[in-house]
């Protein structure tokens, strides 16, 4: 994987990232919502990409809790039976069916806040989440297709004469790798059982005036560029070139 580098600014140019636990929410400010929600769509579905290891808050339709009869969260995760979390206002009781993940909870007491939270989102939280609100005016739904995003681990190394390998390991979805300058490249994808994908791009540069090569990894969680200085092949006879 190349020689040990003097500092972080040569072989593995790792972008500095903030790993603090972030929270994301698609909840709207209820003051901005039309009072009469029935004039809006009665059912809203949203695709929502969420970064792994962050916190997520999912919201019900903006219906005043005083008008409520029942709130139900329906959670459909891959390979698991459907989980439901229900709250009946009249009796002030909550009920859960087939819900085993302790990280998926009501944000607070459902009589105060109908939102659902996922603490420290994991790959297993990929799925469909739907809030169903039963009111005297009818049923209102809001659904989320939650797509958990996993930042790939990026490495770059030279493995043969003027050939470099860039890997974006275990990303979700698959990362896209491009090079500066463009080389003669082959890209392979490896799919893992947990839904992540490793992308490996191997490039060769025949032209000898290429000094450094940059691997640019594009991903929904953010982009990263690494570069290395191409080294002569070990054991090769010395040469002198003009540029």
């Amino acid at each position: 994987e190349g020689a040990a580098q003097p500092n972080n600014s040569l072989m593995l140019q790792t972008s500095k990232e903030n790993h603090a636990l972030a929270s994301s929410s698609l909840c709207m400010d209820e003051k901005q919502i039309t009072q009469n929600y029935s004039k809006v769509l009665a059912e809203v579905n949203t695709s929502w990409p969420v970064k792994m290891a962050t916190n997520a808050v999912l919201c019900c339709p903006p219906i005043a809790l005083r008008n409520l009869i029942i709130i139900t969260w329906e959670i459909i995760l891959r390979g698991q039976p459907s989980c439901t979390k229900a709250y009946k206002k009249e009796t002030n009781e909550t009920k859960e069916t087939n819900c085993t993940d302790e990280r998926i909870t009501w944000v607070s007491r459902p009589d105060q806040n109908s939102d659902l939270q996922i603490r420290t989102v994991a790959i297993t939280h990929d799925g469909y989440y739907r809030c169903i609100m039963v009111t005297p005016d009818g049923n209102f739904h809001r659904g989320y297709h939650l797509q958990v995003l996993v930042t790939p681990e990026v490495t770059l190394f030279q493995n043969r004469n003027r050939t470099a390998v860039c890997k974006a390991v275990a990303g979700k979805p698959a990362a896209h790798i491009s090079w500066i300058p463009e080389g003669d490249c082959a890209t392979k994808q490896e799919y893992w059982s947990n839904g992540t994908v490793t992308v490996k791009s191997t490039c060769h540069w025949e032209v000898h005036n290429v000094s450094t090569v940059t691997c640019h990894v594009s991903h929904l969680t953010g982009n990263k560029s690494l570069y290395i200085e191409l080294l002569p092949v070990p054991g090769a006879k010395k040469s002198a070139k003009l540029y």
């Epitope: 290429v210 002569p232 540029y243």
Partner: antibody, heavy 114, light 105 residues
Framework: EVQLQQSGTVLARPGASVKMSCEAS????????MHWVKQSPGQGLEWVGA????????NYNQKFKGKAKLTAVTSASTAYMELSSLTNEDSAVYYC???????WGQGTLVTVSA | DVQMIQSPSSLSASLGDKVTMTCQAS????LNWFQQKPGKAPKLLIY???NLEDGVPPRFSGSGYGTDFTLTISSLEDEDMATYFC?????????FGGGTKLEIK
């Protein structure tokens, strides 16, 4: 800690040759290209060439063909640049640098004067 | 050779100002940004277009891709008075921008 220590100021006559050194420490000397950069008074920076101490491969800027010669002694972790047939145009500060500009020597001032 | 056009060649700004300078390359490249003070060697600020070198204040940032690149100082400080260079290291010969001399008003 990575350090590049360059030899001191040189005063030379036109037509003469000078050889300056760059001693490296704090990293594996044979694993990185060592580049040399020229900075003339009040001017920008110009790449002279580079040497890979691991096998003494060299790359030169066409402009410095026949002017600069790069060598390295791995046992001393030291790179050298020799400038020949000096003229006033060669008066400048010369830097050695490695790891794609991460580390620089303090520079060697060469003054060519009759 | 890759031509590097750096602009402006000089600029004067007040303390606290946001300052930007640009480098334009004749080919698609990757670059580093350096700061140089009189009588001193260049100091690496930004590597690989946008990565802040260890120990460099976060008021410095780099951006761009391909042929157009920018160095930004978000809030100018006294110690930032220097000349700034870009370097393209993708192709040999390496080529530098002409430099931007930054002065404090």
């Amino acid at each position: 800690e990575v350090q590049l220590q360059q030899s001191g100021t040189v005063l030379a006559r036109p037509g003469a040759s000078v050889k300056m050194s760059c001693e490296a420490s704090g990293y594996t000397f044979t694993s990185y290209w060592m580049h040399w950069v020229k900075q003339s008074p009040g001017q920008g920076l110009e790449w002279v060439g580079a040497i890979y101490p691991g096998n003494s491969d060299t790359n030169y800027n066409q402009k410095f063909k026949g002017k600069a010669k790069l060598t390295a002694v791995t046992s001393a972790s030291t790179a050298y640049m020799e400038l020949s047939s000096l003229t006033n145009e060669d008066s400048a500060v010369y830097y050695c640098t490695t790891a794609v500009g991460s580390y620089w020597g303090q520079g060697t001032l060469v003054t060519v004067s009759a | 050779d890759v031509q590097m056009i750096q602009s402006p060649s000089s600029l004067s700004a007040s303390l606290g100002d946001k300052v930007t300078m640009t480098c334009q390359a004749s080919h698609t490249i990757n670059l580093n940004w350096f700061q140089q003070k009189p009588g001193k060697a260049p100091k690496l600020l930004i590597y690989g277009t946008s990565n802040l070198e260890d120990g460099v204040p976060p008021r410095f940032s780099g951006s761009g891709y391909g042929t157009d690149f920018t160095l930004t100082i978000s809030s100018l400080e006294d110690e930032d008075m220097a000349t700034y260079f870009c370097l393209q290291h993708t192709y040999l010969p390496w080529t530098f921008g002409g430099g931007t001399k930054l002065e404090i008003k």
